[in-house]
């Protein structure tokens, strides 16, 4: 058993039929020493007196907020979260899997630049008595500061028959350097608690890795004289790492239509600007990434051929 | 500490080209000893992260650019003192900062290539023959010396009397090209930079 | 399976015209840019130029603009490529190439020998 | 137009053997890039688009590498069918332009 926050403790539970259990003992927060009686929950079914209570806790019947009292007086609370282990392997119920980009992804994180400020979401079909706690450092033996805001439902999907919602986190880095060399990981660990299972899960990347600009912003489009070629200009996203001469971009130009099936016209650059052959009902779309590390690219900037 | 913005004409920077040369054999090599090497921990998220540069060199804070100089966080640099004079720079318009950041360059990539030249002697006493260094990557390295062309002294390469464990040999492989990467990196932003400004 | 077969070999005399054809299979095809592209013996590809069935857009690579003409029927799934004023160095297999991507090329006809003699 | 410049013309490899084959463009062209492979009598066959990205059906011996200016055909081990005539063509504007072919023959 440990602490997860002040009053509030998680019991770590091998999980299978007929397992025995944690026994666990829980001391009345209070200087009075006689008259102390125990209940779990809403129910009045006195548990046990004396200030401490000893429990063996096997399944989530057991698990709740403890309360000791004296005289109809409430002295304190104790609230017991389980932690299943299954076959070794700690329980992911809460989350869904991304599977991407490999199976067991529960957490995917994602940097619009070079800053230190990183955003990341994972997906559940639980919408009610849910709880979110997010930790994060650079390192996990000698840790380096880096903060994390609340996680927040950012989006509700409809899936099937299913609901399936989104939640956000935003955390800097305390002290980043956007020219700085990473050796060591970003670990972003996030608590979950659904009713009364505690679950924690944990990500760890490097921010050069998780690199996803912006789409470039300003799409311009000029017809070129005698020709079915159109030169198309952009700028760099706002967003993105500055000096735009050290961070530099690459992109990718693409002419298409509305299918994915259809023709198309694509061509890869590192300025701001190329000549393309448009087609009625096309499309011209741009799209970027960092020109000498490899990571994400960004979502479509898009302008109509027309 | 940081890179001036005066720097040779846009496009007459004669490092550019080589540094992306770098860039391209160095990942190329990498990725051949992740496939190569599949059953050896030799991924970014498998390998420990080292820095052979690290208290040696100060490539990142020596060329940092002029607009990151008023990020606190960038500074906590440390003192290097380099040899001044290369070709790379034109010579009338560069300023010690320059030198200093090219200078941290070269020392970079000299002591990589003593690592890489060891490091390929004893693959090739490998009896499984899996893996040896790129010579195009050694030979890219040695190009952009010599255009970086600072005069220092030699390293010796290091010699081993004992039996190569080949097993370490090739994580070390691994952790190596992972550290050499990203400092290549480094390396063509800084070129791009200088080309620009 | 994608596939375009050529009209057969011809002989030319230098000043004339030639107009090889080129019938697609397998697939829609004004899904596709065709292109024609020639190869003089011995020598390497020279892009002549492309068209989109779908609109007849064309574009002509500029040594040869104002000689070739590049059409398209899509009522017989056929393209037609025509060069005019002939000469002796025009000489070459001349082959038809098809692509969703208009900029290179993922399956090609067998070619067509010209042969530019007097 | 860009100029695609081959080298070597002619490359002689031993069977097993793996061959590397360099094309340079006379102008920045990105990865705008592509492999082919042309037997004698036959039209040419697509083995890389965009300097790296692989084709389905064409083995995995054959990879593509490079950007801006230069850029690497490689063949980890050739095979007796590899023995071929090899071209690069650039996509970065029009005229697409190809280079004038590496032949690769038995050594």
């Known amino acids: 058993i440990w602490e997860l926050k002040k009053d509030v403790y998680v019991v770590e539970l091998d999980w299978y039929p007929d397992a025995p259990g944690e026994m666990v003992v829980l001391t009345c927060d209070t200087p009075e020493e006689d008259g102390i009686t125990w209940t779990l929950d809403q129910s009045s079914e006195v548990l046990g007196s004396g200030k401490t209570l000893t429990i063996q806790v096997k399944e989530f019947g057991d698990a709740g907020q403890y309360t000791c009292h004296k005289g109809g007086e409430v002295l304190s609370h104790s609230l017991l979260l389980l932690h299943k282990k299954e076959d070794g392997i700690w329980s992911t119920d809460i989350l869904k899997d991304q599977k991407e980009p490999k199976n067991k992804t529960f957490l995917r994180c994602e940097a619009k630049n070079y800053s230190g400020r990183f955003t990341c979401w994972w997906l559940t079909t639980i919408s009610t008595d849910l709880t979110f706690s997010v930790k994060s450092s650079r390192g996990s033996s000698d840790p380096q500061g880096v903060t994390c805001g609340a996680a927040t439902l950012s989006a509700e999907r409809v899936r099937g028959d299913n609901k399936e919602y989104e939640y956000s986190v935003e955390c800097q880095e305390d002290s980043a350097c956007p020219a700085a060399e990473e050796s060591l990981p970003i670990e972003v660990m996030v608590d979950a608690v659904h009713k009364l299972k505690y679950e924690n899960y944990t990500s760890s990347f490097f921010i050069r890795d998780i690199i996803k600009p912006d789409p470039p912003k300003n799409l311009q489009l000029k017809p070129l004289k005698n020709s079915r070629q159109v030169e198309v200009s952009w700028e760099y996203p706002d967003t993105w790492s500055t000096p735009h001469s050290y961070f530099s971009l690459t992109f990718c130009v693409q002419v298409q239509g509305k299918s994915k099936r259809e023709k198309k016209d694509r061509v890869f650059t590192d300025k701001t600007s190329a000549t393309v052959i448009c087609r009625k009902n096309a499309s011209i779309s741009v799209r970027a990434q960092d020109r000498y590390y490899s990571s994400s690219w960004s979502e479509w900037a898009s302008v109509p051929c027309s | 500490r940081n890179l001036p913005v005066a720097t040779p004409d846009p496009g007459m920077f004669p490092c550019l080209h080589h540094s992306q040369n770098l860039l391209r054999a160095v990942s190329n090599m990498l990725q051949k000893a992740r496939q190569t090497l599949e059953f050896y921990p030799c991924t970014s998220e498998e390998i420990d992260h080292e820095d052979i540069t690290k208290d040696k060199t100060s490539t990142v804070e020596a060329c940092l650019p002029l607009e990151l100089t008023k990020n606190e966080s960038c500074l906590n640099s440390r003192e290097t003192s380099f040899i001044t004079n290369g070709s790379c720079l034109a010579s009338r318009k560069t300023s010690f900062m320059m030198a200093l950041c090219l200078s941290s360059i070269y020392e970079d990539l000299k002591m990589y290539q003593v690592e890489f030249k060891t490091m390929n002697a004893k693959l090739l006493m490998d009896p499984k023959r899996q893996i040896f260094l790129d010579q195009n990557m050694l030979a890219v390295i040695d190009e952009l010396m010599q255009a970086l062309n600072f005069n220092s002294e030699t390293v010796p390469q290091k010699s081993s009397l004992e039996e190569p464990d080949f097993y370490k040999t090739k994580i070390k492989l691994c952790i190596l090209l992972h550290a050499f990467r990203i400092r290549a990196v480094t390396i063509d932003r800084v070129m791009s930079y200088l080309n620009a400004s | 399976q994608v596939q375009l077969v050529q009209s057969g070999a011809e002989v030319k005399k230098p000043g004339s015209s030639v107009k090889v054809s080129c019938k697609a299979s397998?697939?829609?095809?004004?899904?596709?840019?065709l292109h024609w592209v020639r190869q003089a013996p011995g020598q390497g590809l020279e892009w002549m130029g492309w068209?989109?069935?779908?609109?007849?857009?064309?574009e002509y690579a500029p040594k040869f603009q104002g000689r070739v003409t590049i059409t398209a029927d899509e009522s017989t799934s056929t393209a037609y490529m025509e060069l005019s004023s002939l000469r002796s160095e025009d000489t070459a297999v001349y082959y038809c190439?098809?692509?969703?991507?208009?900029?290179?090329?993922?399956?090609w006809g067998q070619g067509t020998l010209v042969t530019v003699s007097s | 137009d860009i100029v695609m410049t081959q080298s070597p013309l002619s490359l002689p490899v031993t069977p097993g053997e793996p061959a590397s084959i360099s094309c340079r463009a006379s102008?920045?062209?990105?990865?705008?890039l592509h492999w082919y492979q042309q037997k004698p009598g036959q039209a040419p066959r697509q083995l890389i688009a965009?300097?790296?990205q692989s084709i389905s059906g064409v083995p995995s011996r054959f990879s593509g590498s490079g950007s801006g200016t230069d850029f690497t055909l490689t063949i980890s081990s050739l095979q007796p069918e590899d023995f071929a005539t090899y071209m690069c063509?650039?996509?970065?504007?029009?005229?697409?332009?190809f280079g004038q072919g590496t032949k690769v023959e038995i050594k």
């Open positions: 190439a098809r692509n969703k991507e208009l900029r290179y090329i993922d399956v």
């Open positions: 397998g697939g829609t095809f004004s899904d596709y840019y």
């Open positions: 068209i989109d069935p779908e609109n007849g857009d064309t």
């Open positions: 102008q920045s062209i990105s990865i705008n």
């Open positions: 965009f300097a790296s």
């Open positions: 063509q650039q996509s970065n504007s029009f005229p697409l332009t």
